[in-house]
């Protein structure tokens, strides 16, 4: 084994190095000392380190470690943050387009419904946006509310245009009749299925991206233990105490120390791998009724079909509703 | 992807959104993200090595520091912890992760469970025996002559048509919504049961 080079007789080199870490403080001995109070850089002979220096080295080592960790995750963190923002904005744009497509359909095909239809369509798509962002709304309720609101307007404006301005009484009866008589056939059910599946997947996709950011942030800002600080100090700075300024740690030794310091963080690995693979599976399945873009941008056409279905069955419906809501109607005219 | 009837969206701006095929779409962007994320799949297991390679370690030098003394880079002592008695590296590992790390692991477990549930083959959760549209083949109302049809021959084309980033700032207002000059569903000449509904019957009148 080669003999260690003789330590700097005056600790001058060590002082100039240490001054960079802690300018102005006179913690470096003028000449090598026994160092019996040292706890980390235990000397085999005289040393140029003091207890205070050792503490400063530990602090610096932990800070270095935190910075290294942050720079290690910078690219990954940026990737997820940027994509989470981009997808959230894109989903909002899809919702906005879907709303405008639906409004355009009403404006072009059912102008007599438009003022109220715009309002109900607006409320529906607001709920869609809120749901994607994590709001505790039931999708089936959203769809039911849309059709419950639309039917009285369709009935009074399209099916029975001669009726006086509808009053609350008949509207409530019509809302009830809408479900009891399956006025829109199976269209609401189709929309519920498609919207709930596509929005569920979209919501989980965004949740997963946001959790990804949280994972990186958590490991990014980890505070390393005192034990780790001591190991890092010994690896990075104890050589200075012997005046070995240009010597670097051995690679294998560094790996052992890092694995020790990061034992907790590395435990995330298994779940992180699973996270990426599960996210990939989800993304691979995001098509057809699991793709909110496909579903929401096609919603106007399904709503259009549902209104046509009502119109085709208008005869039967008008008779049945006439009997069902006659009481409300009489009260309205009284 | 969703079907956009030309006769409803005659505004050229909208057609641009509706019919772009080769530009970046949401689904292509999602796949691109996954490919990039997959390059980070070993991020946590590779961290110790990454940090060592980004902090000063002896690469070309003959001698290196093992925590206690200068040694030859390829000697057995190079990898060994020079101060075994100071504190035990094994103990440090045995302590287990910090509470914040345990917490984040629990959250990862939870989201992984959700992701798996959502992407089980055939979709997923309780959708066994469902056709591609998400309905059972015989999903007919008891008192209705109705069923939801299967996907059929290319019923929904799998092609996202929203221009992704290029259109991110583009907002289509209802006022822009085309169709003032052309009906989406022009009525047949005179054939409309509703034209005459007033005369047909209305039990509520």
């Amino acid at each position: 084994q080669p003999p260690p080079p003789p330590p700097d007789a005056t600790c001058h080199q060590v002082r100039s190095f240490f001054q960079r870490l802690q300018p102005g403080l006179k913690w470096v001995p003028e000449t090598p000392v026994p160092g019996s109070d040292l706890q980390v850089c235990l000397p085999k002979g005289p040393t140029c380190c003091s207890r205070k220096m050792e503490e400063k080295y530990q602090l610096t080592a932990r800070l270095n470690m935190e910075q290294l960790l942050q720079s290690a995750s910078m690219e990954l963190k940026f990737l997820i943050i940027q994509n989470a923002a981009v997808f959230q904005e894109a989903f909002e744009i899809v919702v906005r387009h879907a709303k405008n497509y639906t409004n355009a359909m009403f404006k072009n095909n059912y102008p007599s419904l438009t003022p109220q239809a715009f309002e109900f369509v607006g409320e529906f798509f607001t709920d869609v946006s809120l749901y994607i962002l994590g709001s505790d709304i039931n999708v089936d309720d959203m769809v039911n509310e849309l059709f419950d609101s639309l039917f009285p307007v369709i009935y009074t404006q399209l099916m029975n245009p001669g009726l006086p301005d509808s009053a609350l009484d008949i509207n409530e009866c019509l809302r009830g009749a809408r479900r009891d008589l399956k006025v829109f056939g199976n269209f609401p059910k189709l929309i519920m299925t498609q919207v709930s599946k596509s929005l569920q997947v979209t919501r989980i996709f965004l949740q997963a991206l946001n959790l990804g950011i949280e994972v990186i942030n958590t490991t990014d800002h980890l505070k390393f233990s005192k034990d780790c600080g001591r190991m890092l100090t010994r690896m990075w700075y104890c050589s200075y105490c012997q005046g070995l300024m240009m010597v670097k740690p051995c690679g294998g030794y560094c790996n052992v120390v890092m694995q020790g310091c990061m034992a907790g963080v590395v435990e995330i690995d298994k779940y992180w791998r699973e996270y990426i693979l599960s996210l990939e599976e989800l993304v691979n399945g995001m098509y057809r009724i699991y793709d909110m873009e496909n579903v929401l941008l096609g919603l106007f056409s399904t709503i259009h079909d549902s209104i046509q279905y009502v119109q085709k069955n208008a005869g039967k419906l008008t008779t049945t509703i006439g009997k069902l809501c006659a009481h409300s109607q009489q009260r309205q005219y009284r | 992807s969703a079907y956009y009837p030309e006769d409803l969206f005659i505004d050229k701006k909208v057609l641009k959104v509706a019919h772009v095929e080769h530009e970046e779409t949401l689904s292509s962007r999602r796949r691109e993200l996954i490919q990039k994320l997959k390059s980070f799949i070993s991020f946590y297991s590779a961290l110790p090595g990454y940090i060592c390679s980004h902090s000063p370690v002896a690469e070309n030098d003959t001698l290196c520091w093992n925590g206690q003394e200068l040694v030859e880079r390829y000697s057995q002592k190079a990898a060994r912890n020079g101060m075994k008695n100071q504190f035990n590296l094994h103990e440090l590992k045995m302590k287990g992760p910090e509470p914040v790390v345990s917490q984040i692991i629990d959250k990862l477990k939870h989201i992984n469970q959700l992701l798996r549930t959502m992407s089980m083959p055939k979709g997923r959760v309780l959708d066994k025996n469902l056709d591609e549209e998400g309905f059972e083949a015989g999903d007919c109302g008891d008192d209705e002559d109705e069923c939801i049809g299967g996907a059929g021959d290319g019923m929904i084309k799998v092609k996202n048509q929203l221009r992704f980033l290029a259109e991110l700032a583009y907002d289509l207002d209802v006022d822009d919504a085309p169709g003032n000059s052309q009906q989406a569903t022009p009525k047949d000449n005179e054939i409309s049961t509703f034209h005459n509904l007033g005369n047909v019957h209305s039990p509520l009148k």
Partner: antibody
Framework: QVQLQQSGAELARPGASVKLSCRAS????????ISWMMQRTGQGLEWIGE????????YYNEKFKGKATLTADKSSSTAYMQLSSLTSEDSAVYFC????????????WGQGTLVTVSA | DIQMTQSPASLSASVGETVTITCRTS??????LAWYQQKQGKSPQLLVY???TLPEGVPSRFSGSGSGTQFSLKINSLQPEDFGSYYC?????????FGGGTKLEIK
């Protein structure tokens, strides 16, 4: 002008399936429902069911559930009807017809497809 | 389902005559009734809807009447091209049903 072009005559064995097509032109395919009718030789018309090409939702006459399956391909503006487990009872002319947007009225019809089921 | 009963099942008439075909429904369908004409080997053609409305292009010698459960189709001054089969159909709701048909032959 509105046209519905149906596929040619089919000869099938009992137990087999056939798939009839109805190609629409002259209007926006997704704006109207397509209905299918059956007419046995020298008899009246029976409504089998209809499909809304936009959403793919179908409505069937109770009598034809399990016998007929309606689908539509928007890209080719074509509606299809598959008849399964054929028996001699299914020998008939099958028509597709386009309705109006607000009623079960059929102003436009295909020319009909003769299906003959014979061993 | 609503049952449609047409009568007569067949009738013979000469060119220039007036004929009436009737259709009875099993329940009140108000005015939601259509009539179709079908010639041998051809597809049906819509003649009347909403019980009495003629689509564009249908000659005025055809007229429909009735409401509720009783309906009729009247053809004034029969022309050679009027011979064939006639079907009534309700468009009151799902499922639409057709009558058994009336075969109109040249005497």
């Amino acid at each position: 002008q509105v046209q519905l072009q149906q596929s040619g005559a089919e000869l099938a064995r009992p137990g087999a399936s056939v798939k009839l097509s109805c190609r629409a032109s002259g209007y926006t395919f997704t704006s109207y429902g397509i209905s299918w009718m059956m007419q046995r030789t020298g008899q009246g018309l029976e409504w089998i069911g209809e499909i809304y090409p936009r959403s793919g939702i179908t409505y069937y006459n109770e009598k034809f559930k399990g016998k007929a399956t309606l689908t539509a391909d928007k890209s080719s503006s074509t509606a299809y009807m598959q008849l399964s487990s054929l028996t001699s009872e299914d020998s008939a002319v099958y028509f597709c017809a386009r309705d109006v947007s607000d009623g079960y009225l059929f102003p436009y019809w295909g020319q009909g497809t003769l299906v003959t089921v014979s061993a | 389902d609503i049952q449609m009963t047409q009568s007569p099942a067949s009738l013979s008439a000469s060119v220039g005559e007036t004929v009436t075909i009737t259709c009875r429904t099993s329940e009140n369908i108000y005015s939601y009734l259509a009539w179709y004409q079908q010639k041998q080997g051809k597809s049906p053609q819509l003649l009347v809807y909403n019980a009495k409305t003629l689509p564009e292009g249908v000659p005025s010698r055809f007229s429909g009447s009735g409401s509720g459960t009783q309906f009729s189709l009247k053809i004034n001054s029969l022309q050679p091209e009027d011979f064939g089969s006639y079907y009534c159909q309700h468009h009151y709701g799902t499922p639409p049903t057709f009558g058994g048909g009336t075969k109109l032959e040249i005497k």
